[in-house]
Interface confidence: low
């Protein structure tokens, strides 16, 4: 019995009812192996999910986003809002970084400015949500020929973490 | 059915260059992220580059940074890793993935091996 | 960078047994960050779990991931002779992104 079975091809399942016929996929269902005893629900691409390939009898449905959300998850299993530089990616979303704190990348989530006066610096360029401060000479340390300041390296480590 | 496709690895010179393209089928290559991801003989996986779907956003490990450089041509569904300076420590299997960015690579290649050797 | 930190490096079992991976991170990292491989001789790695928890498209339930904050874990319930393989975790949640230095399940 189960040598029928195995006969059975992609698209098709092998109909216990029917003396182990292969019978085709009903509508909206599929099975992309042969040999199967039933055949598999399509995947339905709905609210901000949009069909970028229909199911076929062989081959599940896939989906994309629509504008304004990207797939996250294996086989794109959740769209998330599109997050931009001054944001975080949260369980909700994407959110705006809180005053104090900045992220100039697309990962990861909102850090804590530099604090210029740990060491004994000043607020060169203010802080933004996209972009950290940066630190230039102390007032004291003001003087002809002081060189420029530079930027900090960006900092690696999350300042907190997303709610 | 989604393929990733490594190709133009090989043995070069410590000094010398190479390119590793990555072909990608079975998926709207234009839609995702992609990285880069290698792996040493007999050692672990080390995240190599990344490039956002328009390609205007990249990002380096820093042992690569300044030597290497990720592009895509969307229109030829490709990804590229343009190797400059190559030393003896980037041998290893290189490996193109898509790239999920929260949720980890889902997709991977079958690697190609660059040897860096004298 | 977050350092991610496995153990142990060589997991000795027979099939059938449960087998309990760990993956510590030098820092703090969100769940939905963390994400679990599987790597066999001579082959690309398989995403197994994402977001710490979730499996992946195809991926058995004998394998089940949890953790939040520094620690995660990789728990097989019962391995079958195909789970004997390395198995690294990876975070996604700050740049660079890194992954753990392997897990290797044995036969025993």
């Known amino acids: 019995l189960q040598d029928l079975c195995s006969n059975c091809p992609a698209g098709t399942f092998c109909d216990n009812n029917r003396s182990q016929i292969c019978s085709p996929c009903p509508p909206n269902s599929f099975s992309s192996a042969g040999g199967q005893r039933t055949c598999d629900i399509c995947r339905q691409c709905k609210g901000v999910f949009k069909t970028r390939k229909e199911c076929s009898s062989t081959s599940n449905a896939e989906c994309d986003c629509i504008s304004g959300y990207h797939c996250l998850g294996a086989e794109c299993s959740m769209c998330e809002q599109d997050c931009k530089q001054g944001q975080e990616l949260t369980k909700k979303g994407c959110k705006d970084c809180c005053f104090g704190t900045f992220n100039d990348q697309k990962r990861g989530i909102c850090r804590p400015w530099t604090n210029c006066s740990l060491d004994g610096k000043s607020v060169l360029v203010n802080g933004t949500k996209e972009r950290d401060v940066v630190c230039g000479p102390s007032p004291a340390d003001l003087s002809p020929g002081a060189s420029s300041a530079t930027p900090p390296a960006p900092a690696r480590e999350p300042g907190h973490s997303p709610q | 059915e989604v393929q990733l496709l490594e190709s133009g690895g090989g043995l070069v010179q410590p000094g010398g260059s190479l390119r590793l393209s990555c072909a990608a089928s079975?998926?709207?290559?234009?839609?995702?992220?992609m990285s880069w991801v290698r792996q040493a003989p007999g050692k672990g996986l080390e995240w190599v580059s990344d490039?956002?779907?328009?390609?205007?956003?990249?990002d380096y490990a820093d042992s690569v940074k300044g030597r290497f450089t990720i592009s895509r041509d969307n229109s030829k569904n490709t990804l590229y890793l343009q190797m400059n300076s190559l030393r003896a420590e980037d041998t290893a299997v290189y490996y193109c993935?898509?790239?999920?960015?929260?949720?980890?690579?889902?997709?991977w290649g079958q690697g190609t091996l660059v040897t860096v050797s004298s | 960078e977050i350092v991610l930190t496995q153990s142990p490096g060589t997991l000795s079992l027979s099939p059938g047994e449960r087998a309990t991976l760990s993956c510590r991170a030098s820092?703090?990292?969100?769940?939905?960050?963390l994400a679990w491989y599987q790597q066999k001789p001579g082959q690309a790695p398989r995403l197994l779990i994402y977001?710490?928890?979730s499996r992946a498209t195809g991926i058995p339930d004998r394998f089940s991931g949890s953790g939040s904050g520094t620690d995660f874990t990789l728990t097989i319930s019962r391995l079958e002779p195909e789970d004997f393989a390395v198995y690294y975790c990876q975070q996604s949640y700050s740049y660079p992104v890194t992954f753990g230095q392997g897990t290797k399940v044995e036969i025993k």
């Open positions: 820092q703090s990292v969100s769940s939905s960050y």
């Open positions: 490039i956002d779907p328009t390609g205007s956003k990249t």
């Open positions: 977001g710490a928890s």
């Open positions: 079975g998926f709207t290559f234009s839609s995702y992220d």
């Open positions: 993935a898509r790239d999920l960015l929260v949720y980890g690579f889902d997709y």
